[in-house]
Interface confidence: low
């Protein structure tokens, strides 16, 4: 007589989370009579997962009619297939008795799910930084299977090099989840740029989950202060202008000082941009030369995004002036934190 | 350094077949799906189809299918390609190109290429 | 199939030009565009993927754009090596299909 053999033809099947896994088992003869039993995993502790004569399985159909006359295909279709079906199925039949007896176990199939990554979410630094430092931004995805999947890093469609990253649990799991940081060197330029973190993975077929981050919430682009005095006016004013260029964020307060005094201060605001997402401001002080005996030091002082204040002197000369001086002369610097980015 | 290294050139009769093979080096045969793509003499590129290297199961062109078979030997991380029946019109250059993106078991972007084996079929 | 046709067929510069090559597509394949080099005697070598990604080593005077069906390649400052065939390819549908090719030349 042929010893009965249980016969589960897939060594492993793959199923994407949300669709159903056929799995397929077939015995050899009728002879024995006894039932067959779907379980998920060996040993004591298996998981019943099937068994025609009763319980509930909501989720389990057979694939064939299992009470048809002759029947020898025990395969079983679970719906609605998540990552926490993943495991090794064993079709096993059983000689019929009180109670049955396990006879006989297929050589098992392993279900792999395959669920998608998250969307990857990209975080930048909590406080920006200027131009030739290195911050770090992060991204995550999660809930993906299987655990091989792979991150990339873009700066403006370059690869980034100076990445880590960690897939986790290290060990068998029914969904992973990765992190990685880049560490990204800022230039003044990087107003408008973008960093991209992006995921392949089995389930996105050839379609990379991207997340990006811009730049503009990282970097500060300190100014740079130019203060110049414009020609003599007949009514003995002078105009001197404070030209704070290249700067960003907009958040910027500009205060003028005459002899060390408060004359004015300024907000920045609906500043227009410059093609690299800087920004540009223009101020006037207009001072009267007859009401001073002596020369006025003016001072433009700018405060940038919090940052401690520039300030840039500028010494009109009251003494024996003529009518007409010389327009566009530059300013001397005192400003001891001054950044000069050109 | 990743490589795809091809077999040399080859010169058959019409009628006979050719197995061209593909070979990659510093990186998994079974991460990145394998294309081929033929280059008749002074023409431009043609794609011919790929090869799912996980499962095995390629993906013929119109024009391709019948004659030519893409198949794998994992054991040796390589990649084949054979034409059957060959014809004048056959003389090309093959070449073996892989697609970019881990797990991408699809026709694609192609990152690297093998360095081309020329079929030359002559009476 | 959709036809990948590229403009001009051939064109003549000097080293230090900016050249701009272009590739229509015969129906939107969003940015599922790669552009490819060959010089004679070689195998294609990649520059570009999704339409403007830079592959790892390619020089950054090499960018390309687009999305939909019309797409650029623009070398912002021709060097010499850079005298070679250039290939725009789609993979957004079965089959990928290559553009018939633009091959540059020294003026």
């Known amino acids: 007589e042929e010893e009965l053999q249980v016969i589960q033809p897939e060594k492993s099947v793959s199923v994407a989370a949300g669709d159903s896994a056929t799995l397929n088992c077939t015995v050899s003869s009728l002879i024995p009579v006894g039932p067959i039993q779907w379980f998920r995993g060996a040993g004591p502790g298996r998981e019943l997962i099937y068994n025609l004569k009763e319980g509930h399985f909501p989720r389990v159909t057979p694939v064939s009619d299992p009470t048809k006359r002759n029947n020898m295909d025990f395969s079983i279709r679970i719906s609605n297939i998540t990552p926490a079906d993943a495991g090794t199925y064993y079709c096993v039949k059983f000689r019929k008795g009180s109670p049955d007896v396990e006879l006989k176990s297929g050589a098992g199939t392993e279900l792999s799910v395959r669920a998608k990554p998250s969307a990857p979410v990209v975080s930048g630094p909590a406080v920006r930084a200027t131009a030739e430092h290195t911050v770090s931004f992060t991204c995550e995805s999660h809930g993906f299977s299987p655990r091989d999947i792979t991150l990339k890093w873009f700066k403006n469609g370059n690869e980034l090099s100076d990445v880590q990253t960690n897939v986790d649990p290290a060990g068998k799991s029914v969904s992973y989840s990765i992190r990685s940081t880049a560490r990204v060197v800022l230039t003044r330029r990087d107003v408008h740029s973008q960093v991209i973190c992006e995921v392949a993975h089995v389930t996105l077929q050839g379609d990379p989950l991207r997340g990006t981050a811009n730049l503009s919430e990282a970097i500060r682009v300190p100014p740079f202060l130019e203060v110049t005095q414009q020609s003599m006016r007949a009514d003995n004013q002078v105009n001197v202008t404070c030209q704070v260029t290249k700067f960003y964020p907009q958040r910027l307060q500009l205060t003028w000082l005459e002899n060390g005094n408060v004359s004015r201060t300024e907000m920045a605001s609906a500043l227009p941009e410059n093609k690299d997402g800087t920004y540009n401001w223009t101020s006037w002080l207009l001072v009267n030369v007859s009401a001073h005996r002596d020369d006025v030091k003016l001072t433009c002082q700018v405060e940038h995004d919090g940052q401690p204040a520039v300030n840039k002197s500028f010494s009109v000369k009251v003494s024996a002036h003529p009518k007409e001086q010389g327009s566009n002369t530059a300013a001397e610097n005192t400003g001891t934190n001054e950044r000069n980015i050109y | 350094q990743i490589q795809l290294v091809q077999s040399g050139s080859e010169l058959k009769k019409p009628g006979a077949s050719v197995k061209v093979s593909c070979r990659a080096r510093g990186y998994t045969l079974t991460d990145y799906a394998m294309n081929w793509v033929r280059q008749a003499p002074g023409q431009g590129l043609e794609w011919m189809g790929f090869?799912?290297?996980?499962?095995?199961?390629?993906t013929y062109a119109q024009g391709f299918k019948g004659r030519f078979v893409f198949s794998l030997d994992t054991s040796v991380s390589t990649a084949y390609l054979q034409i059957g029946s060959l014809k004048a019109e056959d003389t090309a250059v093959y070449y073996c190109?892989?697609?970019?993106?881990?797990?991408?078991?699809?026709?694609?972007?192609?990152?690297?290429w093998g360095q081309g084996t020329l079929v030359t079929v002559s009476s | 199939d959709i036809q990948m046709t590229q403009s001009p067929s051939s064109l003549s510069a000097s080293v230090g030009d900016r050249v701009t090559i272009t590739c229509r597509a015969s129906?939107?394949?969003?940015?599922?565009l790669a552009w490819y080099q060959q010089k004679p005697g070689k195998a294609p070598k990649s520059l570009i993927y999704s339409a403007s990604y830079r592959y790892i080593g390619v020089p950054s005077r090499f960018s390309g754009s687009g999305s939909g069906t019309d797409f650029t390649l623009t070398i912002s400052s021709l060097q010499p090596e850079d005298f070679a065939t250039y290939y725009c390819q789609q993979y957004n549908t079965y089959p990928l299909t290559f553009g018939q090719g633009t091959k540059l030349e020294i003026k």
């Open positions: 190109a892989r697609t970019r993106g881990y797990y991408d078991f699809d026709g694609g972007a192609f990152d690297y």
């Open positions: 129906q939107n394949v969003g940015t599922h």
């Open positions: 090869i799912n290297t996980y499962t095995g199961e390629p």
